[in-house]
């Protein structure tokens, strides 16, 4: 039945964004208000969890902003990236499923830079794995629901 | 039945990446390794077969990257680009679905550049036709398994 | 049935691009030729309505381009930005689901300038509702069909 | 825990110079800049000077630019100060700290090592 | 250069006093504004960052405001552990300076 596939949209949750420049995995999402809503999958421990075996289709939309009312950046050249990365408890190890960004030069000659990343694949998630977001520069996300986001959507069964 | 629909998703073999600064067909990708899977759909001759009519969603992530580490630059100015062409062996002629990819100014001042970009559509594939990608400078592909790649699941039949 | 599920692949019509360089509405896209298509969706007024409630996947990929033989910029720093926004009718009211984009810095030094914005995600739609694209500086889209269109399919039902 | 460890001060003579270094622990020494800050004997704090979490762009205080050197090995995460043309004025506690957010300044120093004394006669 | 003057430079009070201590620049400058406490043979301690925002596992009873040319820092009670020597900081266009510091001694 098609109502019964899972699926997932989670929206960045600012109020607990990490400082430094680091890659770091982001845990605050929203599962239930705006465009966020999740079924047949779980949100728990700032990670996405499969309950059902599947291929899906994942993507993350990642979007860094800096204004200069903001305060002076550290540095102006930026490595602006999002690793999508699973974990499989019964083998804890962390694997990159998908990697995208960009070296940024954000000069103070403009007040405002911006810059989005969009990934997204297909692959086979089986129950109990945790899909979770790394990024670097977090303090720099853009926190609109319509501009940081991930999520996956069961395709298919696993023959 | 849902598992019975045909995808694909293909990683970059970085053992036989051409070099060159021009749009050259990337033909060496793995179907069966790590991420790399494939069902229902054919790997051949560096081109992936659609063996079941139907529409299909279709995406390609391509990373490049340098370090200074591998050299200079012929020039700092790029075009670092992606193209998803579909062939048809009926009528031999090779047309262009999507493209994506920025003109970039990678400068000596920076020791590190990275840049990626994703596409994604949904496409009417018939039964004999193939799917392929070319790139400009393929000799800045980021070889990670994570990093360069592309693939389609099918969506739904042809009325 | 899989093959009654709505979708819509929408090409830019370039023949009626808006001038200027601040956000627009794109009101002018194919939908059924070459690569654009479209079922048991509707394409009017510019917008992409919702005939059917569901899940859908939603897709835009934007392409911006200038070659100095098109004349000078009139500023070198732009926002290249594309907007997905949902409008309901019974409400009316616009909400943006996707944002993506840069800022980016086209000097004179290069003769061409290149840039894509690729977003997705997942969302809810009912009937009646109805999906368009706003982007800024539109003089600057690529008007082939393979870089500048946006698309939608419908994965599931609503429990 | 997070943790800044200083060493490398000294009695030295003036004219000569020094090289004092930070050890990092506890965090991700790499995502965060990295200041020096000093405190004369009966004086308050004065700042020295700071790197940013690359190593990328270095500031000085007017009172130690072209003499005082500031850098970082983040696969080892030490900071560094090297002290050169030393002067009488230079005697203070030297302590390095942490920039609280690794992508702007201006935000503050949230963690502080104990000092290591320089004195210079 | 902007100059960051503290007043007062020496302060008497008791346990449980409200204590004001205050931190003028010699021009308008931003919200940059850190204060930290210091204690003898002790590492610095970063309480308020951004003029007005508690730095974490800060106790409630410090707070920070002020806009423009003058800025302040607050103990609504004072503690025995809170006396000390406190500094303000500003930031402002990759320059970092500090007050002159304003002790908190035992009336």
């Known amino acids: 039945k098609l109502e019964a596939q899972p699926f997932a949209h989670l929206t960045i949750n600012a109020t607990d964004i990490p400082s430094g420049s680091h890659k770091v995995s982001l845990s605050s999402w929203y599962h239930d208000r705006g465009w966020a809503k999740i079924s047949n999958m779980t949100f728990s421990n700032g990670k996405l969890i499969v309950n059902q075996d599947g291929f899906y289709y994942l993507y993350a939309n990642i979007c860094f902003r800096h204004h200069e009312t903001s305060g002076d950046l550290a540095t102006e050249y930026l490595q602006l990236m999002v690793y999508v990365t699973k974990t499989s408890i019964k083998i804890p190890s962390s694997h990159t499923l998908m990697k995208g960004g960009s070296t940024k030069y954000w000069s103070g000659n403009s007040e405002f830079h911006f810059y989005s990343i969009n990934v997204g694949g297909f692959f086979k998630l089986r129950s109990g794995e945790e899909i979770s977001i790394e990024v670097s520069n977090p303090s720099l996300l853009d926190p609109d629901q319509d501009a940081t986001y991930f999520g996956a959507f069961k395709v298919r069964d696993i023959d | 039945k849902l598992e019975a629909q045909p995808f694909a998703h293909l990683t970059i073999n970085a053992t036989d990446i051409p070099s060159g600064s021009h749009k050259v067909s990337l033909s060496s990708w793995y179907h069966d390794r790590g991420w790399a899977k494939i069902s229902n759909m054919t790997f051949s001759n560096g081109k992936l077969i659609v063996n079941q009519d139907g529409f299909y969603y279709l995406y390609a992530n391509i990373c490049f990257r340098h370090h200074e580490t591998s050299g200079d630059l012929a020039t700092e100015y790029l075009q670092l680009m992606v193209y998803v062409t579909k062939t048809s062996i009926k009528i031999p002629s090779s047309h262009t679905l999507m493209k994506g990819g920025s003109t970039k100014y990678w400068s000596g001042n920076s020791e590190f550049h990275f840049y990626s970009i994703n596409v994604g559509g949904f496409f009417k594939l018939r039964s004999g036709e193939e799917i392929s990608i070319e790139v400009s400078n393929p000799s800045l592909l980021d070889p990670d398994q994570d990093a360069t790649y592309f693939g389609a699941f099918k969506v739904r039949d042809i009325d | 049935k899989l093959e009654a599920q709505p979708f819509a692949h929408l090409t830019i019509n370039a023949t009626d691009i808006p001038s200027g360089s601040h956000k627009v509405s794109l009101s002018s896209w194919y939908h059924d030729r070459g690569w654009a298509k479209i079922s048991n969706m509707t394409f009017s007024n510019g917008k992409l309505i919702v005939n059917q409630d569901g899940f859908y996947y939603l897709y835009a990929n934007i392409c911006f381009r200038h070659h100095e033989t098109s004349g000078d910029l009139a500023t070198e720093y732009l926002q290249l930005m594309v907007y997905v926004t949902k409008t309901s009718i019974k409400i009316p009211s616009s909400h943006t689901l996707m944002k993506g984009g840069s800022t980016k810095y086209w000097s004179g030094n290069s003769e061409f300038h290149f840039y894509s914005i690729n977003v997705g995600g997942f969302f809810k739609l009912r009937s009646g509702e109805e999906i368009s694209i706003e982007v800024s500086n539109p003089s600057l889209l690529d008007p082939d069909q393979d870089a500048t269109y946006f698309g939608a399919f419908k994965v599931r039902d609503i429990d | 825990q997070v943790q800044l460890v200083e060493s490398g001060g000294g009695v030295v003579q003036p004219g000569r110079s020094l090289r004092l270094s930070c050890a990092a622990s506890g965090f991700t020494f790499s995502g965060y800049g990295m200041h020096w800050v000093r405190q004369a004997p009966g004086m308050g704090l004065e700042w020295v000077a700071v790197i940013s979490y690359d190593g990328i762009n270095k500031y000085y205080a007017d009172s130690v630019k072209g003499r005082f050197t500031i850098s970082r090995d983040n696969s080892k995460n030490t900071l560094f100060l090297q002290m050169n043309s030393l002067r009488a004025e230079d005697t203070a506690l030297y302590y390095c700290?942490?920039?609280?957010?690794?992508?702007?300044w201006g935000y503050g120093m949230d963690v502080w090592g104990q000092g290591t004394t320089v004195t210079v006669s | 250069d902007i100059q960051m003057t503290q007043s007062p430079s020496t302060l008497s009070a008791s346990v449980g006093d409200r204590v004001t201590i205050t931190c003028r620049a010699s021009q308008s400058i931003s919200s940059w504004l850190a204060w930290y406490q210091l204690k003898p043979g002790k590492a610095p301690k970063l309480l308020i960052y951004k003029a007005s925002s508690l730095e974490s596992g800060v106790p409630s009873r410090f707070g920070g405001s002020g806009s423009g040319t003058e800025f302040t820092l607050t103990i609504s009670s004072l503690q025995p552990d809170d006396f000390a020597t406190y500094y303000c900081?500003?930031?402002?266009?990759?320059?970092?300076?500090f007050g002159q510091g304003t002790k908190v001694e035992i009336k």
């Open positions: 700290a942490k920039c609280l957010s690794g992508t702007y």
């Open positions: 900081q500003h930031y402002n266009s990759y320059s970092w300076t």
